[in-house]
């Protein structure tokens, strides 16, 4: 039950995270005009990964796409790539995890297969989350660098008479959406990996257990417990096995082939 809950929760958290990564990637407000030096601007600029926008005094917003590939900064291209990789991995992870869900029965799929799929999707979610966090962080770093560079030469003019305020950009809403979404995807992935360990069946080879009744002294009580009057003398009553059966908690404490997370 706990395993199913962990897996289900991991799936839902990752789903929300990936939806957030998609939303952040599509958002136009990755960087917004810093209003510190001009809080009363009638023209407000903001930029996304795919286009830049200007909101004018009329309330009209004009957005223009970046219709060049080669003319864009390498960092922006890198951020785009990281976000897309994050989305693709996340989408594949979601697809895999749907089939891995314990609550969904698909044919005669074994628990070992579900465990493998859960682990695979978990790893995909972790990498997806890391890609999103990395992408957003690279962009944020780029903004910080540009912000201080533009602050250094903030004002230019003729003899100090005319002020030309250079537009500076600060963190936009998309960055925060991206960080949170990346974090959620990462958490969801970890939860899937944890769930995988609980799903993994023990590879124990149970051999036949033979019970030999010695006379009338042996009685079988309900519940499967064997009672005997002569413990010492009852040498024939042996259970023959390679490994004893363990409780669910004990199962998790033993290493198995899935314990490499």
């Amino acid at each position: 039950m706990a395993v199913t809950a962990c897996q289900g929760l991991g799936f839902v958290v990752s789903l929300i995270g990936i939806a957030g990564i998609i939303a952040a990637t599509c958002m136009d407000q990755w960087s917004t005009q810093d209003l510190y030096n001009n809080p009363v601007t009638a023209v407000f600029n903001y930029q996304g990964l795919w286009r830049s926008c200007v909101r004018e005094s009329s309330g009209f917003t004009e957005c223009r796409g970046y219709f060049t590939l080669l003319g864009l900064p390498a960092m922006l291209q890198a951020v785009r790539a990281l976000m897309i990789v994050g989305i693709v991995l996340g989408a594949i992870g979601l697809l895999v995890s749907i089939f891995a869900l314990k609550c969904i029965r698909i044919g005669s799929m074994e628990d070992s297969a579900k465990a493998n799929m859960t682990l695979t999707s978990g790893i995909m979610f972790i990498v997806s989350g890391l890609c999103a966090i990395a992408g957003v962080s690279v962009f944020a770093n780029m903004l910080v660098t540009n912000f201080w560079m533009s602050t250094a030469n903030m004002y230019t003019g003729m003899g100090g008479m005319v002020q030309t305020v250079q537009t500076r950009y600060t963190f936009g809403a998309a960055l925060f959406v991206g960080w949170v979404a990346g974090g959620l995807t990462l958490i969801g992935g970890v939860m899937m990996c944890i769930a995988c360990r609980g799903l993994a069946p023990e590879e124990t080879n149970y051999k036949a257990v033979s019970y030999h009744a010695s006379g009338h002294s042996v009685a079988y009580k309900p519940g499967g417990f064997k009672a005997s009057t002569g413990f010492g003398s009852n040498t024939k009553n042996k259970k023959i096995y390679d490994g004893g059966a363990r409780t669910e908690d004990e199962v998790q404490s033993y290493p198995s082939k899935h314990d490499y997370v």
């Epitope: 005009q33 009363v40 601007t41 009638a42 309330g59 009209f60 004009e62 005319v162």
Partner: antibody
Framework: QVQLVQSGAEVKKPGASVKMSCKAS????????MHWVRQAPGQRLEWIGY????????SYNQKFKGKATLTVDTSASTAYMELSSLRSEDTAVYYC????????WGQGTTVTVSS | DIVMTQSPSSLSVSVGDRVTMTCKSS????????????LTWYQQKPGKAPKLLIY???TRESGVPDRFSGSGSGTDFTLTISSVQPEDFATYFC?????????FGGGTKLEIK
């Protein structure tokens, strides 16, 4: 075509208030901010402020804060401006202005403040 | 507030003349976000509302005759009428559309010589 029709001329006593209207047609009213501008005799045009018809958000020229109050009725595609504590200096033609590049102006409402 | 200064305050010209009027702003009206100058020119005739002629310092509004042209960048702008027509005698205003409060120039009155 895009049109702004303003209410008629008003004559008011000092200290009174006046509320003028600006009815928009020919475009989606909530697409653009509605700005208000005044032109006093022999004076340059002065921007009073604007209202965003989507959310009722306003921005005022510091000079007109407390003097002008901007409101909208989106269902009637109408913007309103109320001027309070009128003085003789408030005698002017008041225009509502909208659309992109502030291209469309109303015909103006003349407010005369006289005792 | 951005101060808009227009010169000259009045101009006496004849029909067919070429006219140039200037507008200076106390701060740059250039927006680096879209590489546009947020300066607008209006024409106003007595008893009428102003009429938009030019926006973004040099873009003519649709329906405005091509004899009207705007130029300039940053803080210095000009409006040129290549060949003045009788219907052009009016007052011309420049307006800062870059920063609140939006501000207007004092106007240049075009009169018949």
């Amino acid at each position: 075509q895009v049109q702004l029709v303003q209410s008629g001329a008003e004559v008011k006593k000092p200290g009174a208030s006046v509320k003028m209207s600006c009815k928009a047609s020919g475009y989606t009213f909530t697409d653009y901010n509605m700005h208000w501008v005044r032109q006093a005799p022999g004076q340059r045009l002065e921007w009073i402020g604007y209202i965003n018809p989507n959310n009722g958000g306003t921005s005022y020229n510091q000079k007109f804060k407390g003097k002008a109050t901007l409101t909208v009725d989106t269902s009637a595609s109408t913007a309103y401006m109320e001027l309070s504590s009128l003085r003789s200096e408030d005698t002017a033609v008041y225009y509502c202005v909208t659309t992109r590049y502030l291209a469309v102006w109303g015909q103006g409402t003349t407010v005369t403040v006289s005792s | 507030d951005i101060v808009m200064t227009q010169s000259p305050s009045s101009l006496s010209v004849s029909v067919g003349d070429r006219v140039t009027m200037t507008c200076k702003s106390s701060q740059s009206l250039f927006n680096s976000g879209n590489q546009k100058n947020y300066l607008t020119w209006y024409q106003q005739k007595p008893g009428k509302a102003p009429k938009l002629l030019i926006y973004w310092a040099s873009t003519r509004e649709s329906g405005v005759p091509d004899r009207f042209s705007g130029s300039g960048s940053g803080t210095d702008f000009t409006l040129t009428i290549s060949s003045v027509q009788p219907e052009d005698f009016a007052t011309y205003f420049c307006q800062n559309d870059y920063s609140y409060p939006l501000t207007f120039g004092g106007g240049t009155k075009l009169e018949i010589k």
